[in-house]
Amino acid sequence: TPEVWVQVRMEATELSSFTIRCGFLGSGSISLVTVSWGGPNGAGGTTLAVLHPERGIRQWAPARQARWETQSSISLILEGSGASSPCANTTFCCKFASFPEGSWEACGSLPPSSDPGLSAPPTPAPILRAD
């Protein structure tokens, strides 16, 4: 069964800056990755970035930088200032659309009492939805 993992980290250098990393553990070809916050994409969440393996990347504030890390993982840096900046308990979700498995999504937030800049290695987050 495919899995999606999500890792959220607060940057030590900029305490209101977040890095979200997501990965897909599945057998298919990824056709789209959508990163959202405030809940799953399409269920009250707000899209931060969309990464397409052939058409490139689109991102929206407060997203500062979305990138592919490997063929099956991505990272997103969020700007940490202004009214739309994230807070420590914000939920971030990553949805991977792949062929032939379909769409798989998982969410995560900053671990409680986590030290800035430190985080556990990514582990698969609970799968919230498989379309």
Partner: antibody, heavy 118, light 107 residues
Framework: EVQLQQSGAELVKPGASVKLSCTAS????????MHWLKQRPEQGLEWIGR????????EYDPRFRGKATLTADTSSNIAYLQLSSLTSEDTAVYYC???????????WGQGTTLTVSS | GIVMTQTPKFLLVSAGDRVTITCKAS??????VVWYQQKPGQSPKLLIS???NRYTGVPDRFTGSGYGTDFTFSISTVQAEDLAVYFC?????????FGGGTKLEIK
């Protein structure tokens, strides 16, 4: 137009160090990871490592730790590969390649030939 | 790191022939395999990503397939301009690793 322009060929003596450059145009290196690769004559490609120009964080193949140092100057859009304690085994063509906007190396530099000889 | 074993090392074929190159990963890499073509004196160029997705502008005579540990790359009808070295590469996990390459020569 996206381009990665690498510095010219180098001939250096054993034990010396060398710094190769990769100048990006048509995009901002802060938007990608810059990877460096090594290719010896009639041999395969070896991955040296990658740098995140945004923060300078780099990751290396264990075989190149202590041999290679990756840096980047985001103000001038240039990535660098420094190689130290050179030996004949370091004689090769070195490539920079971008990764991140797409999930593969979509653009490569033309390569820099490094010859280590006394 | 993951070892990518590519075979054969050399292929001598005639124009119009079909060729197949295989790449075997030492552990599962799902579909995180890319195939590159490197013509003499040039940098590598992407042909296939995700094991089977043809890159923009790549002729449809080039195909890739596979999943897990076993991957194949084929040229259905070899043409003279296909003279090159072909590499597989995995980016499933760091360090990125490449197959040893297959040198394709045309009779």
């Amino acid at each position: 137009e996206v381009q990665l322009q690498q510095s010219g060929a180098e001939l250096v003596k054993p034990g010396a160090s060398v710094k190769l450059s990769c100048t990006a145009s048509g995009f901002n290196i802060k938007d990608i990871y810059m990877h460096w690769l090594k290719q010896r004559p009639e041999q395969g490609l070896e991955w040296i490592g990658r740098i995140d120009p945004t923060n300078g964080n780099s990751e290396y193949d264990p075989r190149f730790r202590g041999k290679a140092t990756l840096t980047a100057d985001t103000s001038s859009n240039i990535a660098y590969l420094q190689l130290s304690s050179l030996t004949s085994e370091d004689t090769a063509v070195y490539y920079c390649a971008r990764f991140g906007i797409y999930p593969y190396f979509d653009y490569w530099g033309q390569g820099t030939t490094l010859t280590v000889s006394s | 790191g993951i070892v990518m074993t590519q075979t054969p090392k050399f292929l001598l074929v005639s124009a119009g022939d079909r060729v197949t190159i295989t790449c075997k990963a030492s552990q599962s890499v799902n579909k995180a395999v890319v195939w590159y073509q490197q013509k003499p004196g040039q940098s590598p160029k992407l042909l296939i990503s995700y094991a089977s997705n043809r890159y923009t502008g790549v002729p449809d005579r080039f195909t890739g397939s596979g999943y897990g540990t076993d991957f194949t790359f084929s040229i259905s009808t070899v043409q003279a301009e296909d003279l090159a070295v072909y590499f597989c590469q995995q980016d499933y996990s760091s360090p990125w690793t490449f197959g040893g390459g297959t040198k394709l020569e045309i009779k």
